[in-house]
Amino acid sequence: ITQQDLAPQQRVAPQQKRSSPSEGLCPPGHHISEDGRDCISCKYGQDYSTHWNDLLFCLRCTRCDSGEVELSPCTTTRNTVCQCEEGTFREEDSPEMCRKCRTGCPRGMVKVGDCTPWSDIECVHKESGTKHSGEAPAVEETVTSSPGTPASPCS
């Protein structure tokens, strides 16, 4: 993430004929010119803006990392949507990288949920039915992960 992405410069457009508080804004897919008079299109496939704005620059498109697949490309109004490759997932508490899914559950547990691009396999104790989310010290069975279809932009 660049400084531009975190804190884009802002400026309200000076226009003589003001009819609304939002008049100095540019539509999604654009940013405002240096002098605040014009709206300039973002560059297709390079940068984007998702809301009405007074940004002096559009936001840079995310590039999917190795280990990710591109679900949908960056347009001038929407960032790239990336997804973890089959057999890997992205955790909420570590969204910066895709982690390998476990291949099976520990002894005494059964698989109740497949590996998806946004979650590891889900295991529960055979008797109690309580979930287990730690690393598997021993594997009882090998499971084949099946990918899902989330639609969340990369961070």
Epitope: K17, S19, S20, S22, E23, L25, P27, P28, G29, H30, S33, D38, C39, I40, S41, K43, Y44, W52, T75, T76, T77
Partner: antibody, heavy 119, light 107 residues
Framework: KVQLQQSGAELVKPGASVKLSCKAS????????LHWVKQKSGQGLEWIGW????????KYNEKFKDKATLTADKSSSTVYMELSRLTSEDSAVYFC????????????WGQGTTLTVSS | DIVMTQSHKFMSTSVGDRVSITCKAS??????VAWYQQKPGQSPKLLIY???TRHTGVPDRFTGSGSGTDYTLTIKSVQAEDLTLYYC?????????FGGGTKLEIK
């Protein structure tokens, strides 16, 4: 079906004002930007400005900012353009057109309103 | 303001011919170019945007190309109904501006 229905032809005297309307239907009015475009007889097209009903954002082409005033009535899904201090130079066909909140190309157009300024 | 120049006001062609209509911008417009067709007494109709993306329902005989300042609309096999007026438009920076138009005529 998306439709932009414009008001009828106008014959107006020099110095007067006129208000043209464009009624939108077949889509969510507050999700698209509506524009006005001028076409003088036998000539090219000129972009006048936009009105976005979603946040009342207005932008004028500098050339028209003292000539045109854009407004809207959300209850009837209608945008208006008032042209003031009319001269023969304002005689033209005026189109309303819409675009999504993205690149500034126009996917649907009204049928046009012919304005004639003559004494 | 960016000036869009369509150097040919008229172009002669025949049904079945391939024809290319050109448009030159006074500065780089980063492929933010649209093309419209306008028939007499009608409103313009969007054909192409982002220089080469065909609008929904537009026949595939219409193709757009170009980058920087130079853009082209090509009709690969002209039909009788294509003999009309074409405009280019830059949607890169406001005020959005149009070319002066090119009228396709029968040879």
């Amino acid at each position: 079906k998306v439709q932009l229905q414009q008001s009828g032809a106008e014959l107006v005297k020099p110095g007067a004002s006129v208000k043209l309307s464009c009624k939108a239907s077949g889509y969510t009015f507050t999700e698209y930007i509506l524009h006005w475009v001028k076409q003088k007889s036998g000539q090219g097209l000129e972009w006048i400005g936009w009105f976005y009903p979603g946040n009342n954002n207005i932008k004028y082409n500098e050339k028209f900012k003292d000539k045109a005033t854009l407004t809207a009535d959300k209850s009837s899904s209608t945008v208006y353009m008032e042209l003031s201090r009319l001269t023969s130079e304002d005689s033209a066909v005026y189109f309303c057109a819409r675009h999504e909140q993205g690149p500034g190309y126009f996917d649907y157009w009204g049928q046009g309103t012919t304005l004639t300024v003559s004494s | 303001d960016i000036v869009m120049t369509q150097s040919h006001k008229f172009m002669s062609t025949s049904v079945g011919d391939r024809v290319s209509i050109t448009c030159k911008a006074s500065q780089d417009v980063n492929t933010a170019v649209a093309w419209y067709q306008q028939k007499p007494g009608q409103s313009p109709k969007l054909l192409i945007y982002w220089a080469s993306t065909r609008h929904t329902g537009v026949p595939d005989r219409f193709t757009g190309s170009g980058s920087g300042t130079d853009y082209t609309l090509t009709i690969k096999s002209v039909q009788a109904e294509d003999l009309t007026l074409y405009y280019c438009q830059q949607h890169y920076i406001t005020p959005w501006t149009f070319g002066g138009g090119t009228k396709l005529e029968i040879k």
